[in-house]
């Protein structure tokens, strides 16, 4: 049976928690990604940003999970208007910011 949206979001939160807690060396060798506007379309925007990081096994599961939340196909180099113009941050900070936001969505009951 399909996974309930609450469970899918919980799984994504768990994965982001694991990434932040298990981080020893700089995440993805300190790669930088575009910062995003977290207020709308967060899953696709996050995927559009993270998909440009390659060769980083630590976030591959996150990329796959975000792909399940985003209704359209996302490919590297694709950017929506949700990107914060000309602002790049480290993947580790991106993951932390995303985690805080997704936890709030979960607590509010916004699973879709």
């Amino acid at each position: 049976s399909p996974v309930p949206p609450s469970t899918a979001l919980k799984e994504l939160i768990e994965e982001l928690v694991n990434i932040t807690q298990n981080q020893k060396a700089p995440l993805c060798n300190g790669s930088m990604v575009w910062s995003i506007n977290l207020t709308a379309g967060v899953y696709c925007a996050a995927l559009e940003s993270l998909i440009n990081v390659s060769g980083c096994s630590a976030i591959e599961k996150t990329q796959r999970m975000l792909n399940g939340f985003c209704p359209h196909k996302v490919s590297a180099g694709q950017f929506s208007s949700l990107r914060v113009r000309d602002t790049k941050i480290e993947v580790a900070q991106f993951v932390k910011d995303l985690l805080v936001h997704l936890k709030k969505l979960f607590r509010e009951g916004q699973f879709n």
């Epitope: 996974v3 309930p4 609450s6 469970t7 919980k10 799984e11 939160i13 768990e14 928690v17 807690q21 936890k103 709030k104 979960f106 607590r107 509010e108 009951g109």
Partner: antibody
């Protein structure tokens, strides 16, 4: 020491509004990751979750009672207030407040409970 | 809403017996399962959280296990002070729901 203390009217008439207060000691609801729940237990029966409020004012309600429930917090007094409108004798129960702490993964586990306050709805 | 079904509703066992209480969720709750102990006339007390984790002060005879939809609370050696009603609760997401309770008595 973490303690929660419920206070309420004891006796309420049908159709009236029940107002319950939970005073928090040993922790603050202005602290990140803290939450407070209300749970009730009719005499001789099981536990029923009513509502929850997080430190940042995110609120959740039992859908079966949502239209009658309001949860709020007064951080300056370190209190959480629950209002239940249009009460009926079936709302007779011991009402408990309890603390929830979110840690890493979001846990909804109530680690400290108040002693409860018995509310009787009768004319 | 996630329904929680507890069994048995009551049991009677002798001091020193191993006691198991079961709890089943209507969907996978990913180990977000908590157990509470409620002694007569008292408020519930958190006994086990996240399936198997114990708050400080909970005796070692209490343990929890399970995954997916099926969970178990075990008392390895029942003591007179364990007379209580035990409730499971899913902590995955609101509305938070409890099992109907298991009343444990001493033979």
């Amino acid at each position: 020491e973490v303690t929660l203390r419920e206070s309420g009217p004891g006796l309420v008439k049908p159709t009236q509004t029940l107002t319950l207060t939970c005073t928090l000691y040993g922790f603050s609801l202005s602290t990140s990751d803290m939450g407070v729940d209300w749970i009730r237990q009719p005499p001789g029966k099981g536990l029923e979750w009513l509502a929850h409020i997080w430190w940042d004012d995110v609120k959740r309600y039992n859908p079966a009672l949502k239209s009658r429930l309001t949860i709020s917090k007064d951080t300056s007094k370190n209190q959480v207030v629950l209002k239940l409108t249009s009460v009926d004798p079936v709302d007779t129960a011991t009402y408990y407040c309890a603390r929830t702490v979110s840690s890493g993964y979001i846990y909804y586990a109530m680690d400290y409970w108040g002693q409860g306050t018995l509310v009787t709805v009768s004319s | 809403d996630i329904q929680m079904t507890q069994s048995p509703s009551s049991l009677s066992a002798s001091v020193g017996d191993r006691v198991t209480i079961s709890c089943r969720a209507s969907q996978d709750i990913r180990n977000y399962l908590n157990w509470y102990q409620q002694k007569p006339g008292k408020a519930p007390k958190l006994l086990i959280f996240y399936t198997s984790m114990k708050p400080r002060g909970v005796p070692s005879r209490f343990s929890g296990s399970g995954s997916g939809t099926d969970y178990t609370l075990t008392i390895s050696s029942l003591q007179p002070e364990d007379i209580a009603t035990y409730y499971c609760q899913q902590g995955l997401t609101p509305p938070l729901t409890f099992g109907g309770g298991t009343k444990v008595e001493i033979k």
